[in-house]
């Protein structure tokens, strides 16, 4: 007899999670001499052990915590860039500009990067027929609690000046509902991050309208000021360039704005 | 928005019309050059805006060179042909939510002939 | 290249009646509604009419009609006036700051 099984909203488990996950850690920790000391094996159980046999919307932080201490990584905490829907050119950024950071340039960011993952209760199972969806299902998910959780700690770890890359294509330039907006900008610490800067980049159009000046940004510069942190705005117009530039910066035509 | 500087020129004599604005900021507006040819339809040539970026149409790159002042855009004709005698106008761009071409020069008459 | 048709070159109606313009984009036009239309008469500076598809300028009458969204637009003006006889042209913005604009299509009231 067929065993009756949830049906959420999602997507389900992306397929071959296990080995993904195992792969990209043995291949993260070769690329980078600070992390060789890692065992993968141990991170996959302990990457398994926060989601496996629990119920897939009733996931805490503290599941994570033995994956978060495994995983434990010091980058240089002047040198993060955070992002808000524009993940793509943030990463094209960091791979230029190698001495910067994304989440997702972190181990633990890396393995989980546009992955779905969730169990079932009280089976050992992987669920790779659907996962629940943040909005429609529950929002103490395996993967949001993830981001949430890794997040916290990346924004946490932040100091002098931060950097985040914003969509200026967007309605929402700034969302208040996004990881950078409900998580990232809340756990920058004042003590030890002096400004955040953000980089508004235009979409496939350049306009010349400042938005910077956008009330969505004048949002967030209130919700940063208000924590002791001072804020900068700068409009990126011409994303091509502003990458052309950095992999160029001695490019004649890089003296002007970008 | 008002162009300046058509005449009467001879192939291959660069010349510069200018359209000067005012009531508006070009650090924060676009301006468009756009041309027509006598009985013929409206040509884009390329824009300027607030950062200084240039662009062109692909049939207008070398042929034509835009720049701005504070309060002036230039349209550099860097060698006209028969073929660049047109009435040419600068418009200036609307942004987002509201694009298009909403405020229009008179147009300036450039003639080239032999 | 992109390029920006209007179909038809002219167009007649009577006094009262409608005339529809059509402009047709070989690509979809930037955001899908980077399309404006406009009015040309002889000696006068050119007026915009409808900016991003279907937005009336201010001063423009009701009568004047945008619509359409990525590659297909359409111009309508109804209660035809015989102050409407002009040359009609829309324009598109396209994908890394490019812009055209159709053929024009003449308006002729009867």
């Known amino acids: 007899v067929p065993r009756w099984r949830q049906q959420w909203s999602g997507p389900g488990t992306t397929k071959r999670f296990p080995e993904t996950v195992l792969a990209r850690c043995v291949k993260y920790t070769e690329i980078h001499p600070e992390m060789r000391h890692v065992d993968c094996q141990s991170v996959w159980d302990a990457f398994k052990g926060a989601f496996i046999s629990k119920h897939p919307c009733n996931i805490t932080e503290e599941d994570y915590q033995p994956l978060m201490k495994l995983g434990t990584q010091t980058v240089p905490c002047n040198k993060i860039l955070l992002w808000s829907r524009i993940k793509d050119l943030a990463h094209q950024f960091t791979q230029v500009q190698r001495d910067m950071f994304t989440l997702e340039d972190t181990l633990l960011g890396y393995l989980a990067d546009d992955l779905t993952w969730c169990g079932e209760f009280n089976t050992s199972k992987i669920n790779y027929q659907s996962c629940p969806d943040w909005r429609k299902d529950c929002s103490n998910n395996p993967v949001s609690v993830f981001w949430k959780t890794v997040s916290r700690r990346f924004a946490e770890a932040a100091c002098d000046v931060v950097h985040v890359m914003l969509n200026g294509s967007r309605s929402k330039i700034f969302d208040k509902n996004s990881t950078f907006g409900s998580v990232e900008v809340h756990n920058l610490q004042p003590e030890k991050v002096q400004t955040l800067e953000a980089w508004v980049i235009h979409g496939g159009r350049e306009d010349s309208r400042d938005l910077c000046q956008d009330p969505t940004i004048k949002e967030l510069e209130s919700i940063i000021s208000k924590r002791n942190i001072q804020f900068s705005c700068k409009n990126i117009y011409r994303p091509d360039k502003f990458l052309q530039c950095v992999k160029n910066p001695e490019d004649s035509s890089c003296t002007s704005e970008i | 928005v008002e162009e300046s500087g058509g005449r009467l020129v001879t192939p291959g004599t660069p010349l510069t019309l200018t359209c000067t604005v005012s009531?508006?900021?070009?650090?924060?507006?676009?301006i468009s050059w756009v041309r027509q040819a006598p009985g013929k339809g409206l040509q884009w040539i390329g824009s300027?805006?607030?950062?200084?970026n240039t662009y062109y149409a692909t049939w207008a790159k070398g042929r034509f060179t835009v720049s701005k002042t504070s309060t002036t855009v230039d349209l550099k004709i860097n060698s006209p042909t028969t073929e660049d005698t047109a009435t040419y106008f600068c418009?200036?761009?609307?942004?987002?939510?509201?694009?298009?071409?909403?405020?229009w020069g008179p147009g300036t008459l450039v003639t080239v002939s032999s | 290249a992109q390029v920006l048709t209007q179909t038809a070159s002219s167009v007649s109606a009577a006094v009262g009646g409608t005339v529809t313009i059509s402009c047709q984009s070989s690509e979809s036009v930037y955001k899908n509604n980077y399309l404006s239309w406009y009015q040309q008469k002889p000696g006068q500076p050119l007026k915009c009419l409808i900016y991003?598809?279907?937005t009336l300028a201010s001063g423009v009458p009701s009568r004047f009609k945008g619509s359409g969204s990525g590659t297909q637009f359409t111009l309508t003006i109804s209660d035809l006036e015989s102050d409407d006889a002009a040359t009609y042209y829309c324009?598109?913005?396209?994908?890394?700051?490019?812009?055209?604009f159709g053929g024009g299509t003449e308006v002729v009231v009867k």
């Open positions: 009531g508006f900021s070009l650090s924060n507006n676009a």
């Open positions: 991003s598809a279907s």
């Open positions: 324009a598109g913005g396209y994908s890394g700051n490019i812009n055209g």
């Open positions: 300027i805006y607030g950062s200084g």
């Open positions: 418009a200036r761009e609307g942004a987002g939510s509201s694009w298009g071409f909403n405020l």
